[in-house]
Amino acid sequence: APVLPGEDSKDVAAPHSQPLTSSERIDKHIRYILDGISALRKETCNRSNMCESSKEALAENNLNLPKMAEKDGCFQSGFNEDTCLVKIITGLLEFEVYLEYLQNRFESSEEQARAVQMSTKVLIQFLQKKAKNLDAITTPEPTTNASLLTKLQAQNQWLQDMTTHLILRSFKEFLQSSLRALRQM
């Protein structure tokens, strides 16, 4: 079974090295999740041709997935630590329902999908400790999430494959933007 960073022997600090700082722990955690997404994308791409679809075709799917924009303060241009941190946490909270949707979408990578979901929950906790401006963080309504999940699961097979691909690609992109931004903090 996949293990979280810090749980396997490779990640235990050697006696001569410093224990991981909070920032290093978050960095390692995001990279662990990204590796998990990569494995899931591999399975998705192997079983359908979604990965080669153009961005324009993908954009026709009206999923409202979290996305970084210039105004969020996470890009080099207009970088703002507080605004960005709020955006990262809010975005991760919004992704949770989509990660729940992914849980029954994989055969050979079922454990990996669960590990990505659980690691994301832990990452949110790490980041919430780091955030000063918690008031600005909005948590999605459970009822809204439940109805969205039902709607996604009711789609035909082709749309479900497309949705899976889009979620993984968008989550990867969101995490990579987050990682780059957090490294500036």
Epitope: E24, D27, K28, I30, R31, L34, D35, I37, S38, K42, C51, E52, S54, K55, K67, M68, A69, E70, C74, F75, Q76, S77, R169, S170, K172, E173, F174, Q176, S177, L179, R180, R183, Q184
Partner: antibody, heavy 123, light 107 residues
Framework: QVQLVESGGGLVQPGGSLRLSCAAS????????MTWVRQAPGKGLEWVSS????????AYADSVKGRFTISRDNAKNTLYLQMNSLKSEDTAVYYC????????????????WGQGTQVTVSS | DIQMTQSPSSLPTSLGDSVTITCQAS??????LSWYQQKPGQTPKLLIY???RLQTGVPSRFSGRGSGTSFTLTISGLEAEDLATYYC?????????FGQGTKVELK
């Protein structure tokens, strides 16, 4: 096979502008980060600017920030570098590079390079 | 900004020697470091990424080590085709930065 072909270089006066293009083929362009790297005559490599796949996130070296703009057209498989207010120190060969893709999701490394296009800023 | 200090700038050596080039980062960059080889008149070539991962097609005599702030590139048994300039690159946070380069040449 992967190919990156730069164009648009040339001789320009200080204060002038140039737009470099990089035509990419042999891979799914939209899935990859792309970067411009330059090399002044007889000098080392200098990272100039990167653009990420779908986010529109861009980054610039301090030496070009506010003067250069990186962009991409995924439909045309083309990377651009708009260079304004050019200075003599911008004289260099400009390389278009592709960032590692596939399983490697965070590590920066440039696995394919174009042949480069020469930019000369001189009066 | 994270500065990269590469040493030595020039490395006179003999064929068959083991050669080590060092790159020092001004702050921790985890393992976000890559190494490139550039021969005169040619484009740079990726050798190592992620501090220690060998790029496909690169001979196994090349190896990378390090994490945090200190990194090395080693060529075990220098061959004539390895005479070139080598650069490290930190890809941890913007602005990304290359080392100044190390020219490996014959004594």
């Amino acid at each position: 096979q992967v190919q990156l072909v730069e164009s648009g270089g040339g001789l320009v006066q200080p204060g002038g502008s140039l737009r470099l293009s990089c035509a990419a083929s042999g891979f799914t362009f939209s899935n990859y980060y792309m970067t411009w790297v330059r090399q002044a005559p007889g000098k080392g490599l200098e990272w100039v600017s990167s653009i990420y796949s779908f986010s529109g996130d861009t980054a610039y070296a301090d030496s070009v920030k506010g003067r250069f703009t990186i962009s991409r057209d995924n439909a045309k498989n083309t990377l651009y570098l708009q260079m304004n207010s050019l200075k003599s120190e911008d004289t260099a060969v400009y390389y278009c590079t592709r960032n590692l893709g596939g399983v490697v999701v965070t590590t920066n490394g440039y696995d394919y390079w174009g042949q480069g296009t020469q930019v000369t800023v001189s009066s | 900004d994270i500065q990269m200090t590469q040493s030595p700038s020039s490395l006179p050596t003999s064929l068959g020697d083991s050669v080590t080039i060092t790159c020092q980062a001004s702050q921790s960059i985890s393992d976000e470091l890559s190494w490139y080889q550039q021969k005169p008149g040619q484009t740079p070539k990726l050798l190592i990424y992620g501090a220690s991962r060998l790029q496909t097609g690169v001979p196994s005599r090349f190896s990378g080590r390090g994490s945090g702030t200190s990194f090395t590139l080693t060529i075990s048994g220098l061959e004539a085709e390895d005479l070139a300039t080598y650069y490290c690159l930190q890809g941890y946070s913007w602005p990304f930065m290359f080392g100044q380069g190390t020219k490996v040449e014959l004594k």
